[in-house]
Interface confidence: medium
């Protein structure tokens, strides 16, 4: 059962796993949620009745019954992890804590103009977990305006004390605000020879990489595959760090794979959601329960529904045994990973999907696309919306993309002559325009935010945000698309699609069914050659076939250029302009979304 409210002056008795320090009960709840075993917590606030050494302690707890006896205690605040809840969870914490000194290893000290600058510095430093900034009112003259960057083994402070005229806060890497470069490649036959901070068992290099991304101290990793010569090290995932934040040496070794933490682009990759099944693989761990199940998929569902289950192994039924049901072993461990992985015993293993909600909703796998054809099917492009104007009569105006539960990203040029957001309606989960009737539900628009440098589509900055009056409940037919990561400049997108209800040729009408076309990206250099009279800037991106024939057209404006990379869809472009439609050697020009990520985050995350 999901309990979100905090219990004031209440302490849970027993069940202690570990104690960490957090600046607030709210953040204690987040730490508990992200801990592999924590289900409940008790936080001690500052209080004259409490021993100051216990202030800000956050005791993480577990219980077989998912609850613990409650005891009254002044200044104690208790609650439950969000693991039991179905709503989206984020580790992003932008709060600034006044008069608190969060202790850790002070590895970097420099002068900063403001706490915000100090926080940005922390966000752009590979080692930084949190910071403390001495304000200009700080009593000690030589420490004023000093920004201390800090890290710890756990990513949380080792202690928190009251200190006048300082402020503290956390790195915003988990808010997608870091400029650190993202290296997504996994390097085969490579070992990184740097210090190990931890090791876990993993079924493949991808899971190892996700564990590294989630681990507060891991900057890169080496994974030994099941063919690794040394048997005791097979399936071992070594989590690594170095002073520079980069591997000092790459050693060529067969059957090993290495890669990097993706902490600075984690908003657009799954980190907690290990959705694959591992055949002929047994995961060992503490046994929680053994249940009969029809299939490995059913076993995964059972694990996902059991809040303490972290992973499972399913052994298929022997012929005609137990009504064709196999055994589903629900398991857990101290760190959420199997204690050992065995092969060749016929089991099928996997992980709980309960933690998928801790990843950005946009990373969720969607229905496989129908290959070929130009008409889309329902649920194929769940981020695509149709934007209607009701003045003078109701009609489709532009496309747009869901990027958050209250935000649509579209093109600025769509709003030429639109005097007020009141005349706009956003319809999501729509396949055919004919579905839209008088009583079809829609989202009203609270605000239109047009980029302040926008003049006309051809000169760039053709980007706008719509803030919806109500929030979108995510379903299979309406969910967000990921924004590309700022640190992700090396990705080459090869699977890109443009979608919309626009014209199919220059003189045509709006289409009833959502159309789709696979279109290759074109270099800006090539694009510039095709548009001699225009300036193709790096804030634009082009796509199209040399021979023409497939392109966006009138009515598609504002809609997405969606590209799939590593199983995740990214909003690479916004349909903006072009010469005619699908003309030979005239690619479509799109707003290059990665160049506007800062602008989007600034507008959508404004307090």
């Amino acid at each position: 059962e999901c309990v979100t409210q905090l219990l004031k002056d209440t302490c849970f008795e027993g069940g202690d796993i570990t104690t960490v320090f957090t600046p607030s009960a709210k953040y204690c709840q987040v730490v508990c949620t992200y801990h592999p075993r924590c289900l409940l917590f008790t936080f001690t606030a500052e209080s004259p009745s409490e021993d100051p050494t216990r202030w800000f302690t956050c005791v993480l707890k577990d219980s077989v019954t998912e609850t613990l006896p409650r005891v009254n205690r002044t200044a104690a605040i208790s609650g439950y992890s969000f693991k039991q809840c179905s709503h989206q969870i984020s580790a992003c914490n932008k709060d600034i804590y006044v008069d608190l000194d969060m202790k850790g290893i002070n590895y970097n000290s420099s002068v900063a103009k403001s706490a915000q600058e100090c926080q940005e510095r922390c966000t752009d430093d590979v080692h930084c977990h949190f910071f403390t900034y001495a304000t200009r009112q700080f009593p000690s003259l030589e420490h004023r305006n000093i920004c201390l960057l800090k890290h710890t083994q756990t990513g949380t402070p080792t202690r928190i004390t009251k200190l006048d005229k300082v402020v503290s806060g956390f790195s915003l890497k988990s808010c997608a605000l870091s400029n650190l470069a993202c290296i997504r490649d996994i390097f085969p036959n490579t070992v990184f020879a740097d210090s190990n901070i931890d090791s876990v068992m993993a079924p493949d290099a991808f899971v190892c990489g996700r564990i590294c991304t989630h681990h507060p101290g891991c900057l890169f990793f080496t994974f030994f595959s099941q063919e690794w010569p040394k048997e005791s090290q097979r399936n071992l995932c070594l989590l690594k760090t170095s002073e520079s934040g980069l591997p000092s040496t790459r050693i060529k070794k067969s059957k090993a794979l290495s890669g990097f933490s993706l902490q600075s682009c984690r908003h657009s990759i799954p980190v907690f959601c290990h959705s694959s099944f591992y055949h002929d693989t047994d995961f060992l761990g503490e046994e929680l329960d053994i249940v009969a199940a029809k299939s490995h998929e059913a076993c995964q569902k059972l694990c996902t529904n059991a809040v303490r289950c972290q992973f499972f192994t399913y052994t298929p039924a022997q012929a005609s045994c137990n009504e064709g049901k196999g055994k589903c072993y629900l398991k857990l461990s101290s760190n959420g990973s199997p204690t050992k992985i065995l092969h060749g015993r016929g089991g099928i293993s996997g992980y709980t999907l309960r933690l998928c909600k801790m990843d950005n909703e946009c990373t969720t796998k969607i229905k496989p696309r129908i290959v070929g054809g130009t008409a889309s099917v329902r649920g194929e492009w769940p981020w695509q919306v149709t934007l209607h104007t009701t003045s003078p009569t109701q009609r489709h105006l532009c496309g747009g993309s869901i990027i958050g539960n209250q935000w649509i990203l579209t093109a600025a040029h769509c709003f030429y002559g639109v005097e007020s957001p009141k005349i706009l309606r956003v319809y999501s989960g729509i396949l055919n325009q004919s579905e839209i009737k008088e009583d079809t539900s829609f989202f009203g628009v609270q605000e239109i935010i047009i980029h302040d440098q926008y003049k006309m589509a051809e000169s760039g900055y053709d980007i706008a945000l719509l803030k919806l009056e109500t929030t979108v409940n995510y379903t299979d037919s309406q969910r967000p698309i990921c924004l590309p990561s700022k640190g992700d400049r090396n990705v080459i997108y090869t699977d890109c699609w443009v979608t919309g209800w626009g014209y199919r040729k220059l003189r045509d009408k709006i289409q009833n069914t959502l159309q789709k076309a696979k279109i290759p990206l074109v270099t800006n250099e090539e694009c510039q050659k095709r548009y001699r009279g225009h300036k193709i800037t790096h804030k634009m991106i082009c796509a199209g076939y040399r021979e023409g024939g497939k392109d966006a057209c009138k009515g598609d404006s504002g809609g997405p250029l969606s590209c799939k990379h590593n199983e995740v869809w990214h909003l690479v472009g916004i349909t903006s302009w072009g010469e005619g439609c699908a003309q030979r050697e005239r690619p479509g020009v799109y707003t290059n979304v990665v160049e506007y990520v800062d602008w989007i985050l600034e507008k959508t995350q404004a307090v």
Epitope: E120, D124, V126, L180, A181, I183, G245, P247
Partner: nanobody, 122 residues
Amino acid sequence: QVQLVESGGGLVQPGGSLRLSCAASGYTYSMGAMAWFRQAPGKGLEGVSLIATSSGFISYTDSVKGRFTISQDNSKNTLYLQMNSLKPEDTAVYYCAAGTQFSWSPGSYNYWGQGTLVTVSS
């Protein structure tokens, strides 16, 4: 202390090539990453390309991909930027930077060269 000195800038026609060099001296093995940044007239600093000095990982910004190549010669302690198919919009002062972070943020680099001007014009 680390000193960085750039060279190789100049005037070149659109479509032409240039090779920038950055000679590093001092306590260079403390640097985990080196980068080329540029500043066009009236604009802010823009990251062009990064390289992880020990392991050789490389990253380019979109606008130069396929045209620019970053490389290093460890024996000479020198960083290079080979710039081909130059365009007028590549006109800028190019800076070499060194630091401990593999990052697109200028603030992550502690050491900077004085810059070399590249002008692309017919």
